[in-house]
């Protein structure tokens, strides 16, 4: 029995619902009484949801899963996962047994956008050309881990003297703090870009230092 799932990972935003698609081709005369369907976590084999003896056996996974009962007879064995969280990320296997047997695995990639970075400067007053300043770029509640890039006002990448730390909160979402140490010129703009590699979402922050006063666009 051929079981079909998407080749590419299913990308789901944290907190939203995701559909893990799985389909099979029922033969003529097929009835749901013949169907055994099992969704399980590929790695641990933990049961997620099942259908057997003509009945939906329900969710075994935090009561956040559902089948599409009206579509099962047409060969749609897809699973709806509600309110996706970081811990759901991974591979799910769809097992279908009628008279024959088949299975396939689909990957769930969880994502959450990073907030617009906030910029802080230390020290933040009485600055002169030649002073060393620390610029911190902070962005919150994203997933997966971000890529952080710094550049100056001319678009030249700044790669030296950058320290980036990422810490997961209780929900598994990351807070990113990137610190740039730089020697001031006469004036200058320093920009931080926090990129979510899955969503291809870029969040920008910048600080312009013009002697006095400073501006935070």
């Amino acid at each position: 029995l051929e079981v079909q799932v998407p080749e590419d990972p299913v990308v789901a935003l944290v907190g939203t619902d995701a559909t893990l698609c799985c389909s099979f081709s029922p033969e003529p005369g097929f009835s749901l009484a013949q169907l055994n369907l099992i969704w399980q976590l590929t790695d641990t084999k933990q049961l997620v949801h099942s259908f057997a003896e003509g009945q939906d056996q329900g969710s075994a996974y935090a009561n956040r899963t559902a089948l599409f009962p009206d579509l099962l007879a047409q060969g749609n064995a897809s699973l709806r996962l509600q309110r996706v969280r970081v811990a759901d990320e991974g591979s799910f296997t769809c097992f279908v047994s009628i008279r024959d047997f088949g299975s396939a695995a689909v990957s769930l990639q969880v994502a959450a956008p990073y907030s617009k970075p906030s910029m802080t400067l230390e020290p933040n007053k009485d600055l002169r050309p030649g002073d060393t300043v620390t610029i911190t770029c902070s962005s919150y509640r994203g997933y997966p881990e971000a890529e952080v890039f710094w550049q100056d006002g001319q678009g030249v990448p700044l790669t030296g003297n950058v320290t980036t730390s990422q810490m997961a909160n209780e929900q598994g979402l990351f807070d990113v703090h990137s610190v740039l140490r730089v020697v001031l010129g006469a004036n200058g703009t320093y920009s931080c870009l926090v990129r979510n590699p899955v969503l291809q979402q870029d969040a920008h922050g910048s600080v312009t230092i013009t002697g006095q006063p400073m501006t935070f666009p």
Epitope: L13, N169, Q171
Partner: antibody
């Protein structure tokens, strides 16, 4: 049942200060983002400030209040605060305390609000 | 800052009729959009989050749709208690969290 009860509103003059409190019950207060949202008379909703749950307690502010307002929380007392300094006439509004969802930043429970009037 | 524009500002509808109103975002907010209902003298109440998911206790006559920049809240058959102001809110690009200006649903 989740309950949020604001207090501390009143009438003040421009330039004065006020501290709002929000007593929370019915949920694990320390785990959740909490926010203040205000509504000027006859106007729409305006987000003011947010403090995140968990150990980080990151704070965020609307540009209109940055540098004047400070959000804080006391998890041992299940209480959210908003310290408002250098108050202006345009800060006159009903201030609502709102509980964030665990996963995203929308507000699933709101208090009844407390009125702040800034007038000379 | 993402600006949310709600239309119409006021909607006059008779009880039992269908009401549809719009929230348009100045930038893509994916599905990170919520809807609230507010009655005079009361706090807002969450209706819909993540564009389509009804909050606990919200009747199924309320439904949300859309993605990206264009979103819709539909009340399939207006009940007397549905006459209120409805606000949308985005939580994709923050701070700041932003609300739409509101749509007032009044009795025709």
């Amino acid at each position: 049942d989740v309950q949020l009860v604001e207090s501390g509103g009143g009438v003040v003059r421009p330039g004065e200060s006020l501290r709002l409190s929000c007593a929370a019950s019915g949920f694990t207060f320390s785990s959740y983002d909490m926010s203040w949202v205000r509504q000027a008379p006859g106007e729409g909703l305006e987000w003011v400030s947010l403090i995140s749950g968990g150990i980080s307690a990151n704070t965020h502010y609307a540009d209109s209040v940055k540098g004047r307002f400070t959000i804080s929380r006391d998890n041992s007392k299940n209480t959210l605060y908003l310290q408002m300094n250098s108050l202006r006439a345009e800060d006159t509004a009903v201030y609502y305390c709102a509980k964030g969802d665990l996963w995203n930043i929308f507000f699933d429970y709101w208090g009844l609000g407390t009125l702040v009037t800034v007038s000379s | 800052e993402i600006v949310l524009t709600q239309s119409p500002a006021t909607l006059s509808v008779s009880p039992g009729e269908r009401a549809t109103f719009s929230c348009r975002a100045s930038q893509n907010v994916r599905s990170y959009l919520a809807w609230y209902q507010q009655k005079p003298g009361q706090a807002p109440r969450l209706l819909i989050f993540n564009t389509v998911t009804r909050a606990t206790g919200i009747p199924d006559r309320f439904s949300g749709s859309g993605s990206g920049t264009d979103f819709t809240l539909t009340i399939s058959s207006l009940e007397p208690e549905d006459f209120a102001v409805y606000y949308c809110q985005q939580y994709y690009d923050w701070p700041p969290l932003t609300f739409g200006g509101g749509t007032k649903v009044e009795i025709k």
